[in-house]
């Protein structure tokens, strides 16, 4: 779908405050197939050479209220023998996401968009760039 | 802030459609300090033992319109010699995020929330669980 032309009942895109008062349906549409969702393994956090743990971050004034955040278990990576490899670092992969925060002193269903940087998992990096041959 | 008691001007939380018509200010608040944002390295995708590429996913009817998605470069991981290690797999770390999608046939500033599964980066996993000793 492309943007439809502005009608008199729609806020004008040029209006200074149009972004400040959009209407949103917060009933989550599951656009993921249940197959895709169930195929997505949640055990990578243990099987990775840079394993991580997940901590629960809850804020009742945020949408989504609950976000699970990753933290790397070790500073180093785990080698094939299960030992820490001091030449390789375990680093957090972060992603910037948008969340909705309730506008303070307003109705419970009035929000503003806010950016949040969340840890998603860890990866193992060397201190120098290597390319597969 | 906590939820304020319902007043006559606020929709009732138990009303069947209360989640379907909330107001959102889309002017993004950057709650990340510029320090935190600038400290976030973007070179992990090359230095990782499970390197990845990023592709641009753009949808003008989505907010945010542009999302960068990761794809693993190899099926296997890259070892210390820069060779592919056939005992270790490079796997995509995915995160479920919420995006706003324009409601079809409605004003350009009326959205619904939709789930989206995005690749954030890759990690190297073994086929068996190993714990660092």
């Amino acid at each position: 779908a492309v943007l439809i032309p502005q009608s008199s009942v729609c806020p004008n895109a040029e209006a200074n405050n149009f972004l400040q008062n959009v209407k949103v349906n917060l009933k989550v549409i599951n656009s993921l197939s249940s197959k895709a969702s169930s195929r997505r393994p949640s055990d990578y956090l243990n099987r990775s050479t840079s394993p991580w743990t997940l901590s629960r971050n809850e804020d009742p004034d945020r949408y989504p209220s609950v976000i699970w955040e990753a933290q790397c278990r070790h500073q180093r990576c785990v080698n094939a023998e299960g030992k820490l490899d001091h030449h390789m670092n375990s680093v957090l992969i972060q992603q910037e996401i948008l969340v909705l925060k309730r506008e303070p002193e307003k109705c419970p269903f009035t929000f503003r968009v806010e950016k949040m940087l969340v840890g998603v998992g860890c990866t193992c990096v060397s201190s120098i760039v290597r390319h597969a041959s | 802030a906590v939820l304020i008691p319902q007043s006559s001007v606020c929709p009732n939380a138990e009303a069947n459609n209360f989640l379907q018509n909330v107001k959102v200010n889309l002017k993004v608040i950057n709650s990340l300090s510029s320090k935190a944002s600038s400290r976030r390295p973007s070179d992990y995708l090359n230095r990782s033992t499970s390197p990845w590429t990023l592709s641009r996913n753009e949808d003008p009817d989505r907010y945010p319109s542009v999302i960068w998605e990761a794809q693993c470069r190899h099926q296997r991981c890259v070892n210390a010699e820069g060779k592919l290690d056939h005992h270790m797999n490079s796997v995509l770390i995915q995160q479920e995020i919420l995006v706003l999608k324009r409601e079809p046939e409605k004003c350009p500033f009326t959205f619904r929330v939709e789930k989206m599964l995005v690749g954030v980066g890759c990690t190297c996993v073994s086929s068996i669980v190993r714990h660092a000793s």
Epitope: N30, S37, S42, L54, P60, P108 | V2
Partner: antibody, heavy 121, light 106 residues
Amino acid sequence: EVQLVQSGAEVKKPGSSVKVSCKASGYTFTDYEIHWVRQAPGQGLEWIGVNDPESGGTFYNQKFDGRATLTADKSTSTAYMELSSLRSEDTAVYYCTRYYRYESFYGMDYWGQGTTVTVSS
Amino acid sequence: EIVLTQSPDFQSVTPKEKVTITCSASSSISYIYWFQQKPDQSPKRWIYATFELASGVPSRFSGSGSGTDYTLTINSLEAEDAATYYCHQRSSYPWTFGQGTKLEIK
């Protein structure tokens, strides 16, 4: 219709383990966390911990940390609670309950029917 | 941990009477939740986020409070309200419940 159906009653020996299942239906399994709560005979409610089927994340009441293991199988929409090193004080009804990840003020809205675990030598 | 203390532990009430159950928290919390439990049944969510009645809960029930002091009120008790009521907090780990208040109909 939302349902959380738990496995049947168990009788266990002290020192052994028990694994209780909770099969969810009537909603999107990964939109909700699964919390576990127990109730000893004639007593109040005690929170054990939470599992997030979406991410695999778990968080435990410290009292149960190390003894309780919460897991979930997304393919069958089933959550599990395993309790090890059982003692007589673990005799209780164990409940699973769901918790909406997106808008948490709803709290724990639907509960399983409960699974009675009896620990006796 | 936050301790929730309910008062009274037990109350025998005649139908149509007004009933007040209080829940006092050892530290300030943002919301209180109330559950109703009848013998040999699972708990049912009764009041959430302090004020909101769960679906199907009669309007004679109400919830109020803030900080450390919360109340569940039944305006005109009916026989079907005989049950044990638990308050619950999830503002701080571990999540905790009150010891319960058993309501009996005279």
